[in-house]
């Protein structure tokens, strides 16, 4: 069964900067990745970025840079300008659409006792939804 993992880390040099790392573990090719915060995509979450292997990437503030790390993993840099709720208490969700498996989504957040530079373990918190 395919799995999605999510890691959230605070940057050691910039306490208002965070990076979300997401990856897809499974066969098939990724056709679209959607990153949201505050909840899953389509279920109360706010879209932060979409990444397509050919059409490119798009992000919305407070996201700053969305990029592919490998063919099956992405990273999203965020900057907390104070205009939005603090990232430390926020859930980030990544949804991977792949062919022929469908859509798989997991969520993660910064561990409560996180030191800068430390990341959440790459344990998927699966949302049981395969579209």
């Amino acid at each position: 069964t395919p799995e999605v993992w999510v890691q959230v880390q605070m940057e050691a040099t910039e306490l208002s900067s965070f990076t979300v790392h997401c990856g897809f573990l499974g066969p098939g090719s990724i056709s679209l990745v959607t990153v949201s915060w505050g909840g899953p995509d389509g279920a109360g979450g706010t879209k932060l970025a979409v990444l397509h292997p050919e059409l490119g990437t798009r992000q919305w503030a407070p996201a700053r840079q969305a990029r592919w790390e490998t063919q099956s993993s992405i990273s999203l840099a965020l900057e907390d300008s104070g205009a939005s709720s603090p990232f430390a208490n926020t859930t980030f969700c990544c949804k991977f659409a792949s062919f022929p498996e469908g859509s798989w989504e997991s969520c993660g957040s910064l561990p409560p006792s996180s030191d800068p530079g430390l990341s959440a373990p790459p344990t998927p918190v699966p949302i049981l939804r395969a579209d």
Epitope: G38, G39, T46, K47, W60, A61
Partner: antibody, heavy 119, light 106 residues
Framework: QVHLHQSGPELVKPGASVKISCKAS????????INWVKQRPGQGLEWIGW????????YYNEKFKGRATLTVDKSSSTAYMLLNSLTSEDSAVYFC????????????WGQGTTLTVSS | DIQMTQSPSSLSASLGGKVTITCKAS??????IAWYQHKPGKSPRLLIH???TLQAGIPSRFSGSGSGRDYSFSISNLEPEDSATYYC????????FGGGTKLEIK
Amino acid sequence: QVHLHQSGPELVKPGASVKISCKASGYTFTAYYINWVKQRPGQGLEWIGWIFPGSDSTYYNEKFKGRATLTVDKSSSTAYMLLNSLTSEDSAVYFCARDGELRGPFDYWGQGTTLTVSS
Amino acid sequence: DIQMTQSPSSLSASLGGKVTITCKASQDINKYIAWYQHKPGKSPRLLIHYTSTLQAGIPSRFSGSGSGRDYSFSISNLEPEDSATYYCLQYDNLLTFGGGTKLEIK
């Protein structure tokens, strides 16, 4: 077919408030950001802010913070912009526009709502 | 906030000719620039996004290029209906429009 239909022209007095609507159809309303744009007579376009209907999350141009309030009604697929403490500087055409994500920002626009602030 | 300086503010060109409009950003916008056509009494129309990607249904005589802070937009084989005001929009960091360029076809 994606369509954004805005409410009609408004004539209001200085100091009053106005609420402009933008009814969306032809796509999943909660999945795309809605933006609002201002154009004063003879001037250029100015971004006011956006709202993500799926979560009611908003982001404003600093210039419009505290003056504009963006909301949505998911049940009717309608976005609203409330402008308060109006002055003659607010007389303008206001557009709503959908963010098309990978198809580009502002891929579909409403027809515009003319606001006239005059005593 | 990112500022977009668009030039020229107006220009006049001949039917069948070519024009180029430029936009300079106050910082690198990573190719996140779009171009719009706006005619009086109408809604703006998206022509190009991500520097050079033509929107569906837009003729290939419209084109865009650039990187970093400097971007340009061109229209070749000018037609009478190209008379309009054109705007650039950066969407790398929030959204900022350029000041607009009013194009008149002679």
